[in-house]
């Protein structure tokens, strides 16, 4: 229940990639505004996105404080121009979000191949270690800093002249693979967290091929 001119938010959804985390909901407001609160299971509620007409709220700053915690958010609905008004039970109308644990649930962003270098019949492929908004000692941590060995990369590679793919894995950000001399290869990588049950894999990176500017060749 609530006042006659407000409706509760619904379809509260967490959208999170590499810990950049936004709570979205419906409906688009008509004569009402929203305020969001977030807390850990054992913590106090903190208000964000005060009296907004948006249907999203960036909660990144809160969840990066401890990405292994489980968070709950709620969205309050108020009549526009009368935010002191409450529901029939004496408090504003609100709806709870699903629980969200960033470390287990944030989507893995599309990785990028930073470089590749050929030395004879070996190629070293390096994956860019993307910076996140998670901080430690006043510095932003990379994806590898946050996930450590929980994060692996899968490399797909194939000769430019054929369709048969090969694959390799690394729990660092570098691959060292064997190639045939004189052949050009193309590469794509995918991030994976094997221990997860949801949001386990990223999309594939853009394909990079030898003979393009990212690469370097040495005899």
């Amino acid at each position: 229940s609530g006042t006659t001119n407000t409706v509760a938010a619904y379809n509260l959804t967490w959208k999170s990639t590499n810990f950049k985390t936004i709570l979205e909901w419906e409906p688009k407001p008509v004569n009402q505004v929203y305020t969001v609160q977030i807390s850990t299971k054992s913590g106090d509620w903190k208000s964000k996105c005060f009296y907004t007409t948006d249907t999203e709220c960036d909660l990144t700053d809160e969840i990066v404080k401890d990405v292994k915690q489980t968070y709950l958010a709620r969205v309050f609905s108020y009549p526009a121009g009368n935010v002191e008004s409450t529901g029939s039970a004496g408090e504003p109308l609100y709806e709870n979000s699903p629980e969200f644990t960033p470390y287990l649930e944030t989507n893995l962003g599309q990785p990028t191949i930073q470089s590749f270098e050929q030395v004879g019949t070996k190629v070293n492929v390096t994956v860019e270690d993307e910076r996140t908004l998670v901080r430690r000692n006043n510095t932003f941590l990379s994806l590898r800093d946050v996930f450590g060995k929980d994060l692996i990369y899968t490399l797909y590679y194939w000769k430019s002249s054929s369709s048969g793919k090969k694959t390799a894995k690394t729990n660092t950000n570098e691959f060292l693979i064997d190639v045939d001399k004189g052949e050009n290869y193309c590469f794509s990588v995918q991030a994976v967290i094997p221990s997860r049950t949801v949001n386990r894999k990223s999309t594939d990176s853009p394909v990079e091929c030898m003979g393009q500017e990212k690469g370097e060749f040495r005899e």
Epitope: I152, T154, K166, A168, K169, P194, K201, T203
Partner: antibody, heavy 117, light 107 residues
Framework: EVQLVESGGGLVQPGGSLRLSCAAS????????MHWVRQAPGKGLEWVGL????????IYDPKFQDRATISADNSKNTAYLQMNSLRAEDTAVYYC??????????VGQGTLVTVSS | DIQMTQSPSSLSASVGDRVTITCRAS??????LNWYQQKPGKAWKVLIY???SLAEGVPSRFSGSGSGTDYTLTISSLQPEDFATYYC?????????AGQGTKVEIK
Amino acid sequence: EVQLVESGGGLVQPGGSLRLSCAASGFNIKEYYMHWVRQAPGKGLEWVGLIDPEQGNTIYDPKFQDRATISADNSKNTAYLQMNSLRAEDTAVYYCARDTAAYFDYVGQGTLVTVSS
Amino acid sequence: DIQMTQSPSSLSASVGDRVTITCRASRDIKSYLNWYQQKPGKAWKVLIYYATSLAEGVPSRFSGSGSGTDYTLTISSLQPEDFATYYCWQHGESPWTAGQGTKVEIK
């Protein structure tokens, strides 16, 4: 409960084809890699190939590259193995396996394919 | 392709014995080595992954060690249910390759 159920095995003539299915339940195949592995009678395990059902990437053991096609129908939560130009040496139990990227955590009971005239 | 050489191919042991199975890769596989157990007529199940990590639900009498090219599976005190065939698998690069298997039989 996670389950993998292979089907489509049976007697095939030399030179013929087979299409095996691996019906998954209890999880979404798009979240994992799906492999096919075979085991000839009294022999060890032999890897055929894998698919990433979400991205569509397939990888094969080079010895099967020209004869095997692994595919997936995400709407049916099912992976497939098509093998052509079958010979007696392809007689085996064919297993599908779910790969976490760290290990095969679930394996089906297998389906027996016998290649004989 | 990476070749995996597993030894012995079979062994006889008694309940309570310590059993060791080894696997050698033709080149460094950076601990992308798993051990699986297979019983007759059954699917195979993971025991050890990343060379040393015990899979969920696997008894602690199983352990894995090694790095580089040489890896070992140890059963500290063989139990009746451990009589089976054991395989090592490398999964660091394609094609995935398995050892030939070690059949552990009752003495």
